[in-house]
Amino acid sequence: NECPELQPPVHGKIEPSQAKYFFKDQVLVSCDTGYKVLKDNVEMDTFQIECLKDGTWSNKIPTCKIVDCRAPGELEHGLITFSTRNNLTTYKSEIKYSCQEPYYKMLNNNTGIYTCSAQGVWMNKVLGRSLPTCLPECGQPSRSLPSLVKRIIGGRNAEPGLFPWQALIVVEDTSRVPNDKWFGSGALLSASWILTAAHVLRSQRRDTTVIPVSKEHVTVYLGLHDVRDKSGAVNSSAARVVLHPDFNIQNYNHDIALVQLQEPVPLGPHVMPVCLPRLEPEGPAPHMLGLVAGWGISNPNVTVDEIISSGTRTLSDVLQYVKLPVVPHAECKTSYESRSGNYSVTENMFCAGYYEGGKDTCLGDSGGAFVIFDDLSQRWVVQGLVSWGGPEECGSKQVYGVYTKVSNYVDWVWEQMGLPQSVVEPQVER
């Protein structure tokens, strides 16, 4: 018995294609690339029907439906734009992922273009089905930092957004009687990590051993400008406190530490990371000018509430900054060796300041970033962390501020942050 002639579905075909079909003949219905066989609301790659004894087909011819990649996955810190009208998500449609500029940049300068494949997945030529990564942009404040030609003596008020990486670290040890509390600065490296000096996060209860403060006792404020007004600031508790394992309290060698924030902070005009330098044992070149910012909080009797709310009895309510030249290593070593005491300026430190002394050598909290503008990458790079020297004998002649040489610790920092160097290339100074 002969079965009726078959019409292939639109965007599909039937095989084998014959003039006549008889009892027990079978045909396979398939669809063109980018289409799927649809039968009873079920999608499939092919569908088989058979010519029955009574001259009828075992099933109706299914339809071919265009493949739909559906709504693309959301990209953290990113946006999606559709290239086709009506935001189509069907076969051969194109979308483009982009990062929330200017605060995030796409890793490896990926195009971000994804095409809906015949398999029903969004595909990128380089990443395949993996989503791109939006990394925080670093070292590019929303406001231009001042030209470094004219020297600044003493401190200047910083405009909001001038030092978007600046963090205020508040340590309050409630396990002590009375409660112990102190303050320091730090620098935002990513949405989740703060770089600071180890001595800021060390518990002074122990002198023969280096013990970090408990993470529960650490609060970090970002986007803070005036300590009397914390409404615009982001505060975060610490998930981890990591001191450099070789930090030495005798001479402050390896005075570097990290705080991992409990939650990533949203980046914006007043909260942006600073760039890490490349691994460079020499550190910043002598006479290069850098900037250090800080509130200069030094009064031991100030309560946390006073600092954050009223800002009373602080050196400055508004974030200050100062411009300082890097001092040749030999000159700095000599200046400390000539004084009584076993001060050692190691290869993990560099000095900055002016021979004639002045307030410039002691402005800025411990742990704050000494940043230098890198002409090649056009970004601000953290070359130093306020470590010792200046704050104790402010303004003394030829008493330079001593800074942790961050470039010696780049590998250690990446290792702690759990990011392979390749992932963070955009953050490394070129």
């Epitope: 002590r176 509390k181 102190w182 001595h199 002074q204 002198d207 023969t208 009064n299």
Partner: antibody
Framework: QIQLVQSGSELKKPGASVKVSCKAS????????MSWVRQAPGKGLKWMGW????????TYADDFKGRFVFSLDTSVRTPYLQISSLKAEDTAVYFC?????????WGQGTLVTVSS | DVLMTQTPLSLSVTPGQPASISCKSS???????????LNWLLQRPGQSPKRLIY???KLDSGVPDRFSGSGSGTDFTLKISRVEAEDVGVYYC?????????FGQGTKVEIK
């Protein structure tokens, strides 16, 4: 090279106050706490408490709460011990010692004599 | 407060002979960080104290190696392998584990 130099001996009348200083040199001052220790004539040593030189927060042993105050002037690297309402039993040599717990370097001591 | 008990309270030693001082604490001095903050110092006549040993057995720089410290938990010992004339004075143990830090009553060492 690490030195703690204390102020000189004091003779005070009961009810008066005294302030003992301890000038530190030769190390990063804010890296170590500073302890204060009392030694009464012919007696042993008694730990009075310590001050965190980074935060400026003092901690007192129970026997030294009230009339005893530890303070700091970081700019001149000097901790101070002030005793108010002096009593005859406060007569002692008062030592400063580097460290909250280490007490690895000691000042030469300051004799405070309370006598009418 | 942790009570530190030293024995003997005085000791008269012939030069070149060994000496041993015991220090017992009323509770274990092992801290939660795994370290034992037990220290020894010497106060020579008319002088300020000088730390000799920290963390039970670590010698301070400049301290002769004839001095040694040992012990754990609540029982500690300071040993001088060969006493010299400059070793005279009062030896104190003290603990920095439990607040407030406390000293032993002192052991006076003199030369025979």
């Amino acid at each position: 090279q690490i030195q703690l130099v204390q102020s000189g001996s004091e003779l005070k009348k009961p009810g008066a106050s005294v302030k003992v200083s301890c000038k530190a040199s030769g190390y990063i001052f804010t890296s170590y706490g500073m302890s204060w220790v009392r030694q009464a004539p012919g007696k042993g040593l008694k730990w009075m408490g310590w001050i965190n030189t980074y935060s400026g927060v003092p901690t007192y042993a129970d026997d030294f709460k009230g009339r005893f105050v530890f303070s700091l002037d970081t700019s001149v690297r000097t901790p101070y011990l002030q005793i108010s309402s002096l009593k005859a039993e406060d007569t002692a040599v008062y030592f400063c010692a580097r460290g909250g717990e280490a007490m690895d370097y000691w000042g030469q001591g300051t004799l405070v004599t309370v006598s009418s | 407060d942790v009570l530190m008990t030293q024995t003997p309270l005085s000791l008269s030693v012939t030069p070149g002979q060994p000496a041993s001082i015991s220090c017992k604490s009323s509770q274990s001095l092992l801290d939660s960080d795994g370290k034992t903050y037990l220290n020894w110092l010497l106060q020579r006549p008319g002088q300020s104290p000088k730390r000799l040993i920290y963390l039970v057995s670590k010698l301070d720089s400049g301290v002769p190696d004839r001095f040694s410290g040992s012990g754990s938990g609540t029982d500690f010992t300071l040993k001088i392998s060969r006493v010299e004339a400059e070793d005279v004075g009062v030896y104190y143990c003290w603990q920095g584990t439990h607040f407030p830090w406390t000293f032993g009553q002192g052991t006076k060492v003199e030369i025979k």
